[in-house]
Structures are given as structure tokens and as C-alpha cells.
């Protein structure tokens, strides 16, 4: 499957939507660092089957959307940036989904790559888990915000290597 | 490769201005803050100050505020340490490092090779 | 500012030794990172995290504590061990370095 043109730049956009939501200066979040323990695993591609590293990536974007539209997101950052973050992530679930169902086909089922989109999964609700335990606090979106830039980078990086291995 | 290459060594005379440089390379430069530290000749390590790149907001340590500037420009990947006018005290060699930010990940992980300033009449 | 006091602030040692360098932070951090440092050259970083070992560096290497005192274990000092190294508090702005151990040959 080739993902369109409009796909790397759509990326590229909501990267720099992301930067653009930084609301505080993220020298007095310091103390707020936490280690929310990104499956890494999950995106190093030695054995991955090109059906497989896309449900990941998609569940990357959907977790990626579910999060940041919730209530408290639209009470903590800009509405507007919310917005067109929101269309660009759904462009890109678009995309991917068109990908999973000519890849996955009927030989392989996306049950196979559970315990992926579970790493992913438990990865989010480490994320909710802080934001709750740190009352959705300005620093602790911040953290956030610069967590999902290079989660969301690293999930780039994936998309690219993908596309060099056609 | 990750690597942070600083400018030459410098001599100048009190009252000069002098603008060092460190040229990111082999990573995301907009990724990672740059930090600033200073060694003065035969003294330990002391932290002057650092930017995120993406939008050059900076932190300096009150020792040095006021006393030094702290720029970058992102589309050359190169981060700045510049005086308005030396003292014969600011001899010092000055290294600049590479931070992860907000991220859980090493901090001053990569360093630059250093710049020896020397002021003197 | 948190204030970061190391000590010894030299010390002998012979190839083999056990050595142990200790620092204190003015209040309870919970990032500390030790570097080494050889002369001419800059800081390189061992331990991040006051426990988690740097890519790359030797496994005799290891950091331990929290709060307000931590420390760095050298198990079986090597030759090219001996230099200084520095603590530094990555908590909060303004970050802030020990006044540095010298490790010498006895």
C-alpha cells in the first residue's frame, strides 16, 4: 500500500501543531519529567510485517486523538490548533485505514498484533494516569505535549523506513 | 552520528564583543535544548544557561543573566553564546551540550568539543 | 538555587579499588547525573537518572540514592579511570554541578 504525499506532509503539519500548542515555558516544568516507558520495541522494525507496524501506527494516532479530545485537553489548549490537529489526525487514521484492508487482506487478521496495540494502549493510559494524578496542571500537559511530539516523531521515523523498504 | 561542533578558540581584549557558535548535527536539532556551560582555567563545571531551539525561549542561571546572550537559529542548526563587551574574567573555555527537554531521556548527553576564550590587554 | 556539594574533593586510589564519591543536594531532587571529565577534554555523562548507566559506559560504573543524597560507584577502578567527575541536579532551572571529585593513582 502507498500511503499518499499528503500523508508525510499531514505529519509534518501535526508535528508542528503540537509545538504550537505550548501554552507555559517548559523550563518551570522540569520537575514534572516523567517516564511514561514508550514501547520502543514496537517501533523498531527488524521482524515487523509491513500490516503490523501500520495497525500500530494507527493505533498510535487514534490513542493520539482520544487524548487529546477530551474535555480537559479543549480546557488547556488552544481550540483552534485543537481543531486543525484533529483534522490532520483524522486524515491521517484515513489513510492508514485504507492501507490496513488492502495489506491485511484476509490471510492475516489484526488479532495477530495484539499484544502491539496493546503495548500502545497501556502506553496512553500512563499518559491519562499522570494527567489525572497531576490535575490536568499546565506542567503536566506540557510534559505531555513534548512526549506525544516525540512519540509522534518516532512514529514518523517508522512511516519513513516503511516507505524506503517498497 | 550525533554530534555538536563548536567554533575556534577566541583571544580578544577587554571590552570586545564576541558571538561562539555550536552546530548540531546527526539529530533533530529542534528536538533538543542546547545548554551552555563554562569552565574557568583549573575550576569545575558551572551552568550558564540553554534555549529550545524551536522557539528560542531560553533559562539562564542568575549568575549570568544579563551577562551573556543565548540565541539559535534552527534553520542552520546552530546554537549562540554571544558578549556585549569581555572581561579579563570571562577567560574561560565554554562548552555547549545537548538536553532532552521535558523528555525522559539523558540529560547533557553529547557535548561539544569546547571554545577557549582567552581576554586579555 | 539547589546547591550541590560533593565530596571528598580528591582522593587516592590504586587500580582494583572500590571507589565511592558522594553528593548532596541542598533539597529533595530526583535527577542527578554524574560526568567525567579528563583534562582537555569535555564532560562526558555516565549516569543519568541518579541510577540508569549511559550508553556505552562500563558496567563498574553505577549510581545510587535519592532524594537529597546520592552516589557514584566505581567497582574496580582502571587506569583510564582517573579523572574528575561532577554531579549535577537536572531538577530544576538553574542547573547546578558539584565543585567536582579528583580521582588520583595512589
Known amino acids: 500500500c502507498d500511503l499518499p504525499q499528503t500523508h508525510s506532509l499531514g505529519n509534518r503539519r501535526a508535528l508542528i501543531l503540537l509545538a504550537q500548542m505550548r501554552r507555559i515555558s517548559p523550563f518551570s516544568c522540569l520537575k514534572d519529567r516523567h517516564d511514561f516507558e514508550f514501547p520502543q520495541e514496537e517501533f523498531d522494525d527488524k521482524q515487523f510485517q509491513k500490516a503490523q507496524a501500520i495497525s500500530v501506527l494507527h493505533e498510535m494516532i487514534q490513542q493520539t486523538f482520544n487524548l487529546f479530545s477530551t474535555k480537559d485537553s479543549s480546557a488547556a489548549l488552544d481550540e483552534t490548533l485543537l481543531d486543525e490537529f484533529y483534522i490532520e489526525l483524522d486524515q491521517q487514521l484515513n489513510d492508514l485505514e485504507s492501507c490496513v484492508m488492502q495489506e491485511v487482506g484476509v490471510i492475516e487478521s489484526p488479532l495477530m498484533y495484539e499484544d502491539s496495540i496493546l503495548a500502545v494502549r497501556k502506553y496512553f493510559q500512563r499518559i491519562t494516569l499522570y494527567l489525572t494524578e497531576k490535575k490536568y496542571s499546565s506542567c503536566a500537559w506540557e510534559v505531555v505535549r513534548a512526549e506525544i511530539m516525540r512519540s509522534f516523531s518516532l512514529s514518523i521515523n517508522l512511516q519513513k523506513r516503511l516507505k524506503s523498504k517498497e | 552520528e550525533v554530534q555538536l561542533v563548536q567554533s575556534g578558540a577566541e583571544v580578544k581584549k577587554p571590552g570586545e564583543s564576541l558571538k561562539i557558535s555550536c552546530k548540531g548535527s546527526g539529530y533533530s536539532f529542534t528536538s533538543y535544548w542546547i545548554g551552555w556551560v563554562r569552565q574557568m582555567p583549573g575550576k569545575g563545571l558551572e551552568w550558564m544557561g540553554i534555549?529550545?531551539?524551536?522557539?528560542?525561549?531560553?533559562a539562564y542561571s542568575p549568575s549570568f543573566q544579563g551577562q551573556v546572550t543565548i540565541s539559535a537559529d534552527k534553520s542552520i542548526s546552530t546554537a549562540y553564546l554571544q558578549w556585549s563587551s569581555l572581561k579579563a574574567s570571562d577567560t574561560a573555555m565554554y562548552y555547549c551540550a545537548r538536553h532532552p527537554g521535558l523528555n525522559w531521556a539523558p540529560d547533557f548527553d553529547y557535548w561539544g568539543q569546547g571554545t577557549l576564550v582567552t581576554v586579555s590587554s | 538555587d539547589i546547591q550541590m556539594t560533593q565530596s571528598p574533593s580528591s582522593l587516592s586510589a590504586s587500580v582494583g579499588d572500590r571507589v565511592t564519591i558522594t553528593c548532596r543536594a541542598s533539597?529533595?531532587?530526583?535527577?542527578l547525573n554524574w560526568y567525567q571529565q579528563k583534562p582537555g577534554k569535555a564532560p562526558k555523562l555516565l549516569i543519568y537518572w541518579a541510577s540508569s548507566l549511559q550508553s556505552g559506559v562500563p558496567s563498574r560504573f553505577s549510581g545510587s540514592g535519592s532524594g537529597t543524597d546520592f552516589t557514584l560507584t566505581i567497582s574496580s577502578l582502571q587506569p583510564e579511570d582517573f579523572a574528575t567527575y561532577y554531579c549535577q541536579q537536572g531538577y530544576d532551572t538553574p542547573f547546578t554541578f558539584g565543585q567536582g571529585t579528583k580521582v588520583e593513582i595512589k
Open positions: 534555549i529550545d531551539p524551536s522557539d528560542s525561549d531560553t
Open positions: 533539597q529533595s531532587i530526583n535527577n
